[in-house]
């Protein structure tokens, strides 16, 4: 969470941004809020990126002005125009690229004053893992798969019954480069699993952490997955 203040004569406004992460190839949002101003035509929103000449996006007089927009953002950005008057200056970003990572500035000018705040935008790839029982294996085993990760994550297994156990000797993890030559598919196999136990496959890099749980009993298989972004907010 970054709060910036701006001074315009006697007036300053508070601008707040949230560090966030973008998933390569998907659409993302760079969050920014400011003190609301009902005079839409008096609001100017400028998004800038450190190291880039030109603007990422500009919104003024109630509409976009992309005349100064940098080529790398062409056709990829939009503000939530109907939410500007309530203080939302967040930026939608289409088809997030690895090169979109960096420091952004959300600059606001309203009839109340000026303000700005920086935002650190991380880019990578992260996806939910899916765990299945691998019936093809010679012994009972579990297969944990996640289709898209970058940078290369670490993978660890855990068990509810054998808490604190090290499963590195009885698991095998591989990383397969996807067709776009950036992200990778993660596959990890855990061998010699026992019935009536809950196992967790944890995949983590500096952007995100994902966990897949599976419980295998004689009568059913229960699964659960979750994904959390790290260092956000």
């Amino acid at each position: 969470l970054i709060i910036g203040f701006g001074i315009s004569g006697k007036h300053f406004i508070t601008v707040t941004t949230f560090t966030s992460a973008g998933n390569i190839g998907e659409d993302g949002t760079l969050s920014c809020t400011f003190e609301p101003d009902i005079k839409l035509n008096g609001i100017v929103i400028q998004w800038l990126k450190e190291g880039i000449k030109g603007l990422v996006h500009e919104f003024k007089e109630g509409k976009d002005d992309l005349s100064q927009q940098h080529e790398m953002f062409r056709g990829r950005t939009a503000v939530f125009a109907d939410q500007v008057v309530v203080g939302n200056a967040s930026l939608r970003l289409k088809n997030v690229q690895l090169t979109d990572a960096g420091t952004y500035t959300c600059y606001i000018h309203t009839s109340k004053g000026k303000g700005n705040a920086n935002l650190e935008y991380k880019t990578g790839a992260f996806s939910m893992p899916e765990i299945n029982v691998d019936y093809n294996a010679s012994s009972e085993s579990l297969r944990c798969e996640a289709p898209r990760w970058f940078p290369q994550p670490t993978v660890a297994w855990a068990s509810q019954v054998d808490q604190g156990a090290n499963f590195s000797e009885v698991s095998n993890t591989s990383f397969e480069l996807n067709s776009e030559n950036v992200t990778m598919k993660v596959v990890s196999v855990l061998y010699n699993v026992t019935i009536n136990n809950t196992y967790s496959c944890m995949i983590e890099n500096d952007i995100a952490k994902a966990t897949g749980d599976i419980k295998v009993t004689d009568s059913e298989v229960k699964r659960r997955s979750q994904l959390e972004l790290l260092n956000s907010g």
């Epitope: 190839g25 056709g75 939009a78 289409k94």
Partner: antibody, heavy 120, light 107 residues
């Protein structure tokens, strides 16, 4: 409401330059949230995006046509234009102009289209 | 470039019936997809953008769904004016590309 109208020669000789103009009425070409694009459709075939322009003059072209395409804008006339050089029979198509959202980038509305035939 | 593939090429449907048209992208386009209707001698008309948002003035019988690489346009009850060619278009990355079209004809 906003309307677009293509105009230009219906017949162009091989190796010459195809030139079309799109006139925008019912709204300003300087509307900030839009690009202005060209799309073509050979007879009986599908649609191909040619490129777009912003009112400030910045352009983006389809790489398959980039070496032959020029799109320009005249804000004083509320018009934008397409030039396609070194044409062949494969460039025979209905050419449409359209307003293109800055993002989302859908095309709406479209001109009615103009058929350009490349033949000697 | 991203290749858009539509199926079937032709769909024969009786008036009042449901029509389901498919569009597949060669790689993920997230939800950055639009659908258009084109009648003979006319320009295409925008139906759906953002994969599922109906354009202004488009009847509720038209609905879009899907994300990533698989998309569907559904016409819940075909009217006589709906017989036309339908195109999908991705705007996820340049160059923007269209599918080859699906012709919906009267059965």
């Amino acid at each position: 409401q906003l309307q677009l109208q293509e105009s230009g020669p219906g017949l162009v000789k091989p190796s010459e330059t195809l030139s079309l103009t799109c006139t925008v009425s019912g709204g300003s070409i300087k509307s900030g949230s839009y690009y202005w694009g060209w799309i073509r459709q050979p007879p009986g075939k599908g649609l191909e995006w040619i490129g777009n322009i912003y009112y400030s003059g910045s352009t983006y072209y389809n790489p398959s046509l980039r070496s032959r395409v020029t799109i320009s804008v005249d804000t004083s006339k509320n018009q934008f234009s397409l030039k396609l050089s070194s044409v062949t029979a494969a460039d025979t198509a209905v050419y449409y102009c359209a307003r293109e959202g800055s993002y989302p980038n859908q095309f709406d509305p479209w001109g009615q289209g103009t058929l350009v035939t490349v033949s000697s | 470039e991203i290749v858009m593939t539509q199926s079937p090429a032709t769909l024969s449907v009786s008036p009042g019936e449901r029509a389901t048209l498919s569009c597949r992208a060669s790689q993920s386009v997230s939800s950055n997809l639009a659908w258009y209707q084109q009648k003979p001698g006319q320009a295409p008309r925008l139906l759906i953008y953002g994969a599922s948002t109906r354009a202004t003035g488009i009847p509720a019988r038209f609905s879009g769904s899907g994300s990533g690489t698989e998309f569907t346009l559904t016409i819940s009850s075909l009217q006589s004016e709906d017989f036309a060619v339908y195109y999908c278009q991705q705007y996820h990355s340049f160059p923007f590309t269209f599918g080859g079209g699906t012709k919906v004809e009267i059965k």
